[in-house]
Each structure stands twice: as C-alpha cells, then as structure tokens.
C-alpha cells in the first residue's frame, strides 16, 4: 500500500487515520527534503490532485481539510514543488479509513447440527462498519467457570470435543474495531437442547388415482433422535400463502404423508424438523415440485431436474429442485 513508500517528510491525519464516517478531518503534510524549500505543497487522493481547502501553515507544512468525509477508504499522498526540480517530489503517503463503531451484537444463536461435531454460533452484527471489525465469542461453563474465547470475523464453529465443562454454558459476543467495542447479552445454553436433527429430505411424490385423487409425499432423515416434530408446508406455485401440516415423526422408516390436492396444478413442498420440545428448527428443505395429473396417476422423483411426460399409466413429473423463492433457512 501507500504506507510502504520511502518518505521525505511526514503525513498525518487528525483526529486519526481511522475515523468516524461523516467527520471533518485534516490531513497535514510536512516536507523534509534536502536542499528544498518547497514552493508549493500538493495533496493527492487516490491519485487525483486536490484543488481546494489547502492551507499553507509554514514553510514546510500544509493542511488539507475535508468536510463530512464519507469514503470508506482513500490513499493520500503529498508532494512538494522544489526549486530547480522539474518534477514534484514525493513527501509521504498514508491510507485512511472511515467507518462506524460496531453495534451491540444481538440475536446470538448457537446450534449443533446433528453429526457435524460442531456448535455453530451466529449473531446479528448490526450495521455495516466499513472498517475491520473482529468478534470474540466467549463460551463460559456454568459448571466449571472455565471460559474459552474464539476470535472470528463472522460466525464461529466450535468443536463439541472442546466443550469439556459439562453441558451448560453462557455464550456472548464482543465486537471491536478501531472506533469502539460492544458486547452482546449472555445466551444461556444446554448442549442437549440445541441439537438440530439431520436434514429431512423429500425424495419423491406420487398421486394415486382413486375416487378422490391422493398425493403421497415420501420423505426421510438420517437422524438418530427419537422424538422429532416436523412441519411440511405446501402451496400451488401460483399462490403466495403456504399451508402447513404438523407431524410427530419416528424416522425408523421413510415417512409417507398424504395430501388431497387440486388436479392439474403444480405444487411446491418443503419440510423441516426439530427435536420435540426444543427451541431450534432445521432450515426448510429444498423446494420440491410436483404437478398433480388431470386424471392419470403421476410419480415425481427428485432424481430428475426438468418436466418430462411419458405415455402410459405412470407419468413422471420431474422436480426442478432448488429455487429459492421464500426458501429462507431460518432456524428460529
């Protein structure tokens, strides 16, 4: 960067090199060039010469003033016009940054995705700071008082093997940058209460041609958790509103859920589960599409990625898989 150049003088910023966005700042340049009494001192921002708000303070020093500085980053350097020198002589340069102190981190959430071997902690960092902001995640055992700290710039994955202070912990997040430090409230967790079961997946769908046509959705999870509650939501692709069905589930076998749907309409399905009575849900599964037939039965398999129609009794209507419309992976 600009900071690594050889200087023939000194450049500095008031109030500081990193300052709050929107502040008035002054950049000072002091020449110390052998055999040179500068005729003029020039300031450059990102390589472009500044024309205004420059004040000569004395023979060797000048000041550049900015009102309401809003750029997150800028490279500044200054030069001198020396007598008998054809070109300007470089004095020094500095990278400057503006931004905001961190907000108080909130919505601290820690979950253990089954089989992951990690506790994943996330939080809402608040408004963009524009400058380098680090987060320290504190994990303190309520049983031993031992505390571990983890430095990160976003979320953190903590190996459950490293959580050796029992099952109950406090977790909080400290946010810090050059302009300030804030700290979240403390979240109390029990490791057994924050496990999210292995993802539930819809594998196929079929519509059985009966007096009243019936659609069966087949879905499964690799979870070893015994008591699991699930929700399946579905809607016609043309609708905005979801219908939700709730299930108490035992994943010792593939689940089959029955729906009575309108004929000749494309539907979308999603499923999510949680350990019964616990706090956190899985994110909703990928969108699974199934078009109900006009009269003939239809099977939809996740293996195919586009719509195909066969002649004969079994009709395959194929899901397009991973659209993201209203597919928020919320765990709350």
């Amino acid at each position: 960067g600009i900071t690594n150049i050889n200087c023939s003088g000194h450049i500095w910023v008031e109030p500081a090199t990193i300052f709050k966005m929107g502040m008035n700042i002054s950049i000072y340049c002091q020449a110390a060039i052998k055999n040179c009494q500068p005729r003029k001192l020039h300031f450059y921002k990102n390589g472009i010469k500044e024309r205004f708000q420059i004040t000569r303070i004395n023979k060797t020093t000048a000041r550049l003033w900015y009102k309401n500085f809003l750029e997150p980053h800028a490279s500044m350097y200054c030069t001198a016009e020396c007598p008998k020198h054809f070109q300007e002589t470089l004095i020094c340069g500095k990278d400057i940054s503006s931004g905001y102190p961190p907000d108080i981190p909130d919505e601290v959430t820690c979950v253990i995705y089954e089989y992951s071997g990690n506790m994943t902690c996330t939080w809402n960092a608040g408004k963009l700071t524009y400058i380098d902001t680090k987060y320290v995640v504190h994990v303190k055992s309520l049983e031993t008082e031992e505390e571990q700290q983890y430095l990160t710039s976003s979320y953190i994955n903590i190996s459950t093997d490293s959580l050796q202070g029992g099952k109950k912990y406090l977790v909080w997040v400290q946010a810090a940058n050059a302009l300030g430090m804030e700290e979240s409230k403390q979240l109390q967790i029990h490791l057994d209460d924050i496990v999210i079961p292995s993802a539930a997946v819809i594998s196929r769908a079929e519509t059985i041609n009966a007096t009243v046509p019936k659609t069966i959705i087949y879905w499964d999870s690799q979870t070893t958790i015994e008591k699991v509650s699930c929700e399946m939501r579905y809607k016609a692709t043309t609708n905005q509103t979801w219908n939700v069905k709730e299930f108490d589930t035992n994943f010792t076998y593939v689940q089959q859920s029955e729906f009575y749907l309108e004929p000749n309409i494309k539907y979308v399905f999603q499923v999510r589960c949680q350990e019964t009575g616990k706090r956190y849900w899985q994110p909703w599964s990928s969108l699974f599409f199934h078009k109900t037939p006009e009269t003939v039965p239809q099977v939809t398999s996740k293996a195919f990625q586009h719509d195909t129609w066969n002649s004969g009794l079994t009709v395959a209507s194929i899901s397009t898989g991973h659209l993201t419309s209203d597919n928020r992976g919320d765990i709350g």
């Epitope: 303190k140 031992e146 505390e147 983890y150």
Partner: antibody, heavy 121, light 112 residues
C-alpha cells in the same frame, strides 16, 4: 503450586510512569488462562485494575478508570505479567497485587505478596 | 456495569457466633461469585468460588449460597482466626465495556 512475585513498585511523582512486573511459576502457559491486577489503597477495599486472557488469541480488559492510562501485557518466554502505568495520580497510590487461578476462570486462587506504588511530589 | 453491594460494611461478633454477610449484584451473575478473606498486611485468600464451592484447605464452617443477584457467606461458628475483612467478587465477565470494580466494598468482622 503457582507462585507470583510482583516487583517494580516505588515512589513516583504525579504525571510519572511506572512498570510493574509479576513473575509467575507453576502456570501452564500453553493453556488458556487469565492473569489480573488488583490494587488496594491504604485502608481501603480491593479494586480490580485489569486482566489479560491468553488463549488462541490475547484479550485485555480494564476497569473504566484505568483505560488509556494503564496497559497490561505479558511475556510468555519470561513467564511474566506487566502493568505499565502512565500519567500517575495521587489516587493511584496503593499496593498492587497480581492474581490468577492459572486457568481461564476469573476467581483468584493465587495472589502475589503485592508491591507498593506511592504517587507523591 | 455490574455493581457489587456488600453488607454490612462492618460487624462485631464473638467467638462461636454464626455470622452472615450478604452481597448483591446489580444484574444476574448466575453462580459466578467468589468470597475472599483478607487480614491486615496480607494478600486476600480465596474461600468460596462458584457461589458455594469451598476452596481447597478452607474449613467447613465457611459456606456460600445464592445465585442470580443475591449471595450469602456464612461462618457457622466464628473462630479467633476468622476476624478479618471479607470481600465478594463477581466472576461472570470483565469484558463488559464499563466496569469500575468487580469486588464488593468489604465487610470487616471485629471482636465484640
């Protein structure tokens, strides 16, 4: 057994500086731990000054009144904790103790003998 | 800023008395509280940690209780060597940006 020995106290003029040291033995410096400074003005109660957390990273904490004037640091190669005190005032006169449990808890099983800092003209 | 309020500031008692000292935190500190004993010219000595756990080598006449914001140190039968000053300390977190002190003001136990 953890042992803590403070040094560096003495008489200093207002506005002056002093660096206190705390030589530690018996602590596993490869594990996570807190080490702290606590002071006690003559005839007064205990007052927390600062702590340093050492683990996969280093974090420092200060009492509100100590921020900007006092700096805690440590040299793992010398097993020593430091407290750099600048812009000293008469009200900083106290016995300064180094304290730890040798682990990442904030109660203190082990205390040094204390070192007296006197700020006076 | 978590404030620790200890009471009483001093008390007079006789050998054999049951003595109770209380400490109140301005916010929930769970069970993260320690008690210390200090004698003149000496460094403090840890008595109780995690609100109720007895530190190594501390006589069983000392006990601690409480959680959340209200805590108690009890000496079941005061002995001559127990005349000293006692301090509580919150051991929850010091990372909070505005902490002035983590100790209570102290309770001096004197001979009646």
């Amino acid at each position: 057994e953890v042992q803590l020995v403070e040094s560096g106290g003495g008489l200093v003029q207002p506005g002056g500086s002093l660096r206190l040291s705390c030589a530690a033995s018996g602590i596993d410096f490869n594990s996570n731990y807190y080490m702290c400074w606590v002071r006690q003005a003559p005839g007064k109660g205990l007052e927390w000054v600062s702590c340093i957390y050492v683990g996969s990273h280093v974090n420092t904490y200060y009492a509100n009144w100590a921020k900007g004037r006092f700096t805690i640091s440590r040299d793992n190669s010398k097993n020593t904790l430091y407290l750099q005190m600048n812009s000293l005032r008469a009200e900083d006169t106290a016995v300064y103790y180094c304290a730890t449990s040798g682990s990442s808890v904030l109660y203190f099983k082990f205390w040094g003998q204390g070192t007296l800092v006197t700020v006076s003209s | 800023d978590i404030q620790m309020t200890q009471s009483p500031s001093s008390l007079s008692a006789s050998v054999g008395d049951r003595v109770t000292i209380t400490c109140q935190a301005s916010e929930n500190i769970y069970s993260f509280l320690a008690w210390y004993q200090q004698k003149p010219g000496k460094a403090p000595k840890l008595l109780i940690y995690s609100a109720s756990k007895l530190a190594a080598g501390v006589p069983s006449r000392f006990s601690g209780s409480g959680s959340g914001t209200d805590f108690t140190l009890t000496i079941s039968s005061l002995q001559p060597e127990d005349f000293a000053t006692y301090y509580c300390q919150q051991t929850n977190r010091y990372s909070n940006p505005d902490i002035y002190n983590v100790f209570g003001q102290g309770t001096k136990v004197e001979i009646k």
